[in-house]
């Protein structure tokens, strides 16, 4: 049988494929024996297609994203699901099929000129739609490679840091994301006390550069919790 390892943890107890040894064309290996459809049945295979367990979008195929198969289902169980076509509902870019991105909860076309216009539009829109953020989830590789032929310079619209030139990262700016400089020694940085709190930032900073970490500035130790200043300092 095939054993899949995610971050060095084997997904154990995979049943043998139909008809024998792992790897024979047409064979199917059941991935997550405990996952149920909303109706209570185990996954039905279509042409021996077996869902692939995942932890992030990048592990899936180019036309898939990683999510829990049932709305409000067990958050611990995620599989690769078919991407959403244009005008379908979405919560992040990776949910939309290649050539589209998620805007205000709907998959819209991301052809180059159209995409740039859409991004500029989103900056002027009122904040408050749960789905309007261009969040920090992993982005579809084909989307970014389609849109950016050269690495983005400072201020260029981006989807992820790999879209930006060396020394820059992709960070939120209003409701779009642009390439910003990676922070240098002594520059103010953001230390997130709560996991996921970076999602609330409208003006997101880059991370500290190599050999630096974001720590409380020495002379600010006495200050109150809310006003403590963090800067990039040598390890």
């Amino acid at each position: 049988t095939l054993n899949s390892v995610l971050n060095s943890n084997a997904i154990k107890n995979l049943p043998p494929p139909l008809g024998g040894a792992a790897g024979h064309p047409g064979s199917a290996v059941s991935a997550a024996p405990g996952i149920l459809y909303p109706g209570g049945n185990k996954y039905q295979t279509i042409d021996n297609y077996q869902p692939y367990p995942c932890a992030e979008d990048e592990e899936c195929g180019t036309d898939e994203y990683c999510a829990s198969p049932t709305r409000g289902g067990d958050a611990g169980v995620q599989i690769c699901l078919a991407c959403r076509k244009r005008r379908k509902r979405c919560m992040r870019h990776a949910m939309c099929c290649p050539g589209n991105y998620c805007k205000n909860g709907i998959c819209v076309s991301s052809d180059q000129n159209h995409f740039r216009g859409e991004i500029e539009e989103t900056i002027t829109e009122s904040f408050g739609n749960d789905h309007s953020t261009l969040d920090g989830y992993s982005r579809r590789t084909t989307l970014s490679s389609k849109m950016y032929h050269t690495k983005g310079q400072e201020g260029s619209v981006c989807l992820r840091s790999s879209d930006c030139a060396s020394g820059l990262c992709c960070a939120r700016h209003f409701w779009s994301k642009i390439c910003k400089p990676v922070l240098k020694e002594g520059q103010v940085c953001t230390k997130h006390r709560r996991k996921g709190s970076h999602g609330l930032e409208i003006f997101q900073r880059c991370y500290c550069g190599e050999g630096l970490s974001c720590r409380i500035q020495k002379d600010h130790h006495q200050a109150s919790n809310s006003s403590r200043l963090h800067t990039c300092q040598r390890h």
Epitope: S4, V5, S27, A28, Q50, Y52, G61, T141
Partner: nanobody, 129 residues
């Protein structure tokens, strides 16, 4: 021209270790899964291990789980297969292969040889008892 070149094979005693290396040239393989297959004389080619385009994900055949470790370095376009606690039954020609990231993925994708577009020439591993 795309080429996969294996190296590191050889003769080793049972219980010993070897590290196979596969170097890709002619294109970048960062959006490909890289896998190792092996073929013993008179037997079918079988899946050994694979590592996806997403570096966190590795896959192993039952027979090598816990003994073999696959890793990759996209910057150097190389894939390594570290083999320890080798057994005589590991004797085979080991092939490196590359499979493109598909539109849809299933559990058997990585272990299915027909999904791999590029193959190396192979390197012989012989484990003596």
């Amino acid at each position: 021209e795309v080429q996969l070149m294996e190296s590191g094979g050889g003769l080793v005693q049972a219980g010993g270790s070897l590290t196979l290396s596969c170097t890709a040239s002619g294109r970048t393989f960062d959006n490909y899964a890289m896998g190792w297959f092996r073929q013993a004389p008179g037997k079918e080619r079988e899946f050994v291990a694979a590592i996806s385009w997403s570096l966190s994900r590795t896959h192993y055949a039952d027979s090598v789980l816990g003994r073999f470790t696959i890793s990759r370095d996209n910057a150097k376009n190389t894939v390594l297969l570290q083999m320890s606690s080798l057994k005589p039954e590991d004797t085979a020609v080991y092939y490196c292969a590359a499979a493109p990231r598909p539109k849809r993925i299933s559990v058997s994708y990585f272990s299915t040889s027909s999904n791999y577009d590029y193959w190396g020439q192979g390197t012989q591993v012989t484990v003596s008892s």
